[in-house]
């Protein structure tokens, strides 16, 4: 294993005129650790403010975690010659707040990208597609990890965060080959209609620990390869017939529904019937009612139709506060 020589500057990496030169095939950037045998470069927890320009051409796995990158511009990893071997890129926890269009262009082998734990106030619609064409060249990405990328409220720039992420996922239909998508812990209240239809190859989808309140227009019908669907720790009250039928129609899927505030009233009857006969829900015996109060902590599988009633709504004049 080689690491940056002691004569290298200890300041965060800054591009210089020399960076226009092609990198030596085996050199290691300042503040990074490199292993040619493992095809791995780690520039971890070094407060880097830019992506090193002199990355070795052999790099297959690049860890740039725990830095202070702030902005990822177009062509942030574009090199001459290109980093043709780079397959896994981890940028988690690097204080990124802006990922611009074309940030990952000229990485022909990039299979896995992790942007988790960055407060992305701006994610360009063309971050993953690279161009604003209605149909872009397919992205090589197979795994895209976007857990906890929601910015604090004061950085949201008055736009829908759900919409911003969805736009990047569907732009140019570039991510049709994506197998894994993690979107956990992003405060999502909804998914824009048809976003999943643009990701037909998905095998693993993690939407856990969000605030999803309805799946009425989330269509899983096209996701015929889906194997794992994580919906734990959301705000789901009930799943309706259309959703139940779509999930049942997926040949390989396992669905995780724990820790949602299920409302056990008359609207829940179809879901309870479905739960009793389906094999797709993992840990279905753990699902319990949250509302109404009289049903709290009752196990959904143990309910029958007589338990699931809707109290008549009193006219306002008869209601008490």
């Amino acid at each position: 294993t080689s690491s940056a020589s002691s004569s290298s500057s200890s300041a965060p990496f800054l591009a210089s005129a020399a960076s226009a030169q092609p990198p030596l095939p085996d050199q290691c950037p300042a503040l990074c650790e490199c292993s040619e045998a493992a095809r791995t470069v780690k520039c971890v927890n070094r407060n880097l403010t830019e992506v090193p320009t002199d990355l070795p051409l052999y790099v297959r796995n690049l860890f740039l975690t725990g830095n202070q990158l702030a902005v990822l511009p177009a062509g942030a990893f574009a090199r001459r010659p290109p980093l043709a071997e780079l397959a896994a890129l981890n940028l988690s926890g690097s204080r990124l707040d802006e990922v611009r269009g074309g940030a990952f262009e000229h990485l022909p082998s990039l299979r896995q990208l992790d942007l988790s734990h960055n407060p992305l106030a701006y994610l360009s619609p063309f971050a993953f597609s690279g161009s604003n064409a209605s149909i872009s060249a397919p992205s090589p990405l197979v795994e895209l990890i976007l857990n906890h990328i929601v910015p604090p409220d004061d950085k949201r720039q008055n736009r829908s965060f759900e919409g911003m992420v969805a736009a990047a996922l569907v732009a140019g239909r570039a991510l049709q080959g994506l197998h894994l998508l993690e979107l956990a812990s992003n405060h999502f209240l909804y998914l824009p209609r048809d976003v999943l239809a643009q990701l037909p190859s998905l095998r693993y989808l993690d939407l856990s620990n969000n605030s999803l309140v309805s799946l009425t227009y989330v269509s899983f019908r096209n996701l015929t390869h889906l194997e794992s669907l994580h919906l734990e720790d959301n705000a789901l009250k009930v799943l309706h017939n259309g959703t139940l039928a779509e999930l049942q129609g997926l040949p390989h899927v396992r669905v995780f529904l724990d820790n949602n505030p299920w409302v056990c009233d008359c609207h829940m009857a179809d879901m309870v019937t479905w739960l009793k006969q389906t094999g797709v829900v993992q840990g279905k015996d753990r699902l319990t009612c949250a509302f109404p109060e009289k049903m709290r902590n009752r196990v959904l599988l143990e309910l029958n139709s007589a338990d699931l009633d809707c109290d008549p709504i009193l006219p306002p004049s008869l209601q008490t506060s």
């Epitope: 919409g163 239909r173 909804y190 998914l191 209609r193 009425t216």
Partner: antibody, heavy 118, light 107 residues
Framework: QVQLQQSGPELVKPGASVKISCKAS????????VNWVKQSHGKSLEWIGD????????NYNQKFKGKATLTVDMSSSTAYMELRSLTSEDSAVYYC???????????WGQGTSVTVSS | SIVLTQTPKFLLVSAGDRVPITCKAS??????VAWYQQKPGQSPKLLIY???NPYTGVPDRFTGSGYGTDFTFTITTVQAEDLAVYFC?????????FGGGTKLEMK
């Protein structure tokens, strides 16, 4: 910022057709459905239908099937609604609206007034 | 199609009032209800979606609640600029339908 710019007012004769445009800017056009809504003078809102700009797929209110045709031009990020066989009942303001949360419309055009009169 | 019955049609209010508007669906629409505000000569503006979630930038005096068939939209402290027509909309099944509207006017 997100904007939906609709074409100007139309005065047309009964039996004629009219095509209203809605040019979108400030967002990824193909990522969101475009809805069309009718508002007759002093009345409520009526949903005409929606179109998925990504593939041109449409969903119409049965009441407007045969009356309205929705199309998009992805290259110009523009949605269109054609109304045909117009009668005085079709006199109204027509809005295009971008969908945000499914079904809900978070940005609206300024409206296009269509007056059918001989 | 699902019918939404919105009441009342008109409301005379004073600044500072708490104003509830109700919307009743002819069948269950789960929590798939949106509320809009339309000021004279303007396009509608989305205030609430999924029954209770305020849209980005909407003042917190506008709130929504309900599930199934019965929904309430409330302005907790009416201000002069809130004078408008308010519409509910169900987005549960096509065709999406709107309530008849509630017009807010100052006493």
């Amino acid at each position: 910022q997100v904007q939906l710019q609709q074409s100007g007012p139309e005065l047309v004769k009964p039996g004629a057709s009219v095509k209203i445009s809605c040019k979108a800017s400030g967002y990824t056009f193909t990522a969101y459905y475009v809805n069309w809504v009718k508002q007759s003078h002093g009345k409520s809102l009526e949903w005409i239908g929606d179109i998925n700009p990504n593939n041109g797929g449409t969903n119409y209110n049965q009441k407007f099937k045969g009356k309205a045709t929705l199309t998009v031009d992805m290259s110009s990020s523009t949605a269109y609604m054609e109304l045909r066989s117009l009668t005085s009942e079709d006199s109204a303001v027509y809005y295009c609206a971008k969908e945000g949360p499914p079904g809900a419309m978070d940005y609206w055009g300024q409206g296009t007034s269509v007056t059918v009169s001989s | 199609s699902i019918v939404l019955t919105q009441t009342p049609k008109f409301l005379l209010v004073s600044a500072g009032d708490r104003v509830p508007i109700t919307c009743k669906a002819s069948q269950s629409v789960s929590n798939n209800v949106a509320w809009y505000q339309q000021k004279p000569g303007q396009s509608p503006k989305l205030l609430i979606y999924y029954a209770s979630n305020p849209y980005t930038g909407v003042p917190d005096r506008f709130t929504g609640s309900g599930y199934g068939t019965d929904f309430t939209f409330t302005i907790t402290t009416v201000q002069a600029e809130d004078l408008a027509v308010y519409f509910c909309q169900q987005v549960y099944s096509s065709p999406f339908t709107f309530g008849g509207g509630t017009k807010l006017e100052m006493k």
